[in-house]
Interface confidence: medium
């Protein structure tokens, strides 16, 4: 009998509100034994797959997708899914990335604290979305 795959979680570092031109890293987490993580961008039906999976803890694996310089077009909903042979997991909850103009004021923090979306139940459409051009170093600039 095949094991039930737990839903992945998604988080953003350093947070979900990112100043224009700053960096953000999406972190997808799942159980050990994950072969491929996929970061999906909902609004444009794009995604990227990576096998660059590391062990985050004895019971968790993770993959990191970095955007070096956030643009307005990067704002939107993101979610994770993973492949653990021989099947795909359900999608994670959505995480919304907000991009703001850099004000530079001393009272305005650059980012909100790290935010995550765990395995809370919500409808998912299970559609396979578009691959986008890839580059070395797990960059996710193309997810916009």
């Amino acid at each position: 009998q095949e094991e039930d795959l737990p839903r992945p979680s998604i988080s953003a570092e350093p947070g979900t509100v990112i100043p224009l031109g700053s960096h953000v890293t999406f972190v997808c987490r799942g159980p050990v034994g994950v072969q491929t993580f996929r970061l999906e961008r909902d609004s444009r039906s794009t995604y990227n797959d990576t096998e660059d999976v590391s062990q985050a803890s004895p019971s968790e694996s993770e993959a990191r997708f970095r955007i070096d310089s956030v643009r307005e077009g990067n704002a939107g909903l993101y979610r994770c899914i993973y492949y653990k042979p021989p099947k795909w997991s359900e999608q994670s909850d959505y995480l919304e990335l907000l991009v703001k103009e850099s004000s530079g004021g001393p009272d305005s923090p650059d980012t909100e604290p790290g935010s995550s979306a765990g395995p809370t139940q919500r409808p998912s459409d299970n559609s396979h979305n578009e691959h986008a051009p890839a580059s070395q170093g797990l960059k996710a600039e193309h997810l916009y």
Epitope: N48, T50, E51, D52, Y83, W88, H131, A132, A134, Q136
Partner: antibody, heavy 120, light 110 residues
């Protein structure tokens, strides 16, 4: 410059296992996925399988169980486990365009091919 | 199983003319499509990837287009050297016959 070259193609009898080797130069197998594609005489291209930088392997449904792809630091092997006459073809080794993203799994660099003949 | 269909098997056109080659996927492959040129006795050569991006060194006479399940390779200002067989290939989902080729279309230059 980067190159790939296949070797090991020869005439074998049906059922005799055969291993083809792809030797790469000018780039590292830790940075690129690699694939095997074959072409029967006068026919089209057939994808057999791909091996990732993490040595995960992906096969065409018709090739599962019939072929095994593996690699070392400088070579990629294709083993035909129990050849049949229909496996007679030129076998190409090809380099993917990148590494961990599936969107880089098209083939940007090809070897000249090696001819395999299966006949009794 | 992902199947790539590439009709017709052959097409003929004159030097200086234009030829259009079609490729259809059995499911949405979201522009994860490459085109290759293969001349007799040679290995394939990458022309286009991501449905419309020209590979390095490929003349702009070659143009890829399409989305969803339907894709097209258009060659304009045909030259004698363009006589070859052209293949489409997807690299959509590696878990499901993800790198299937079309059957090929032979281009004859009159």
């Amino acid at each position: 410059s980067s190159s790939v070259e296949e070797s090991g193609g020869r005439l074998v009898t049906p059922g005799t296992p055969l291993t083809l080797t792809c030797t790469v130069s000018g780039f590292s197998l830790s940075s690129y996925v690699m694939g095997w594609v074959r072409q029967a005489p006068g026919k089209g291209l057939e994808w057999i399988g791909t091996i990732s930088i993490r040595s995960n392997t992906y096969y065409a449904s018709w090739a599962k169980g019939r072929f095994t792809i593996s690699k070392t630091s400088t070579t990629v092997d294709l083993k035909i486990t129990s050849p049949i006459t229909e496996d007679t073809a030129t076998y190409f080794c090809a380099r993917g365009a990148g590494n961990v993203y599936y969107s880089d799994y098209y083939f940007s660099l090809w070897g000249p091919g090696t001819l395999v003949t299966i006949s009794s | 199983e992902l199947v790539m269909t590439q009709p017709p098997a052959s097409v003929s056109a004159a030097v200086g003319g234009t030829v259009t080659i079609n490729c259809q996927a059995s499911q949405n492959i979201y522009s994860n499509l490459a085109w290759y040129q293969q001349r007799p006795g040679q290995p394939p050569k990458l022309l286009i990837y991501k449905a419309s991006t020209l590979a390095s060194g490929v003349p702009s006479r070659f143009k890829g287009s399409g989305s969803g399940t339907d894709y097209t390779l258009t060659i304009t200002d045909l030259e004698c050297a363009d006589a070859a067989t052209y293949y489409c290939q997807t690299y959509y989902n590696m878990m499901d016959d993800g790198a299937a080729f079309g059957g090929g279309t032979e281009v004859e230059i009159k």
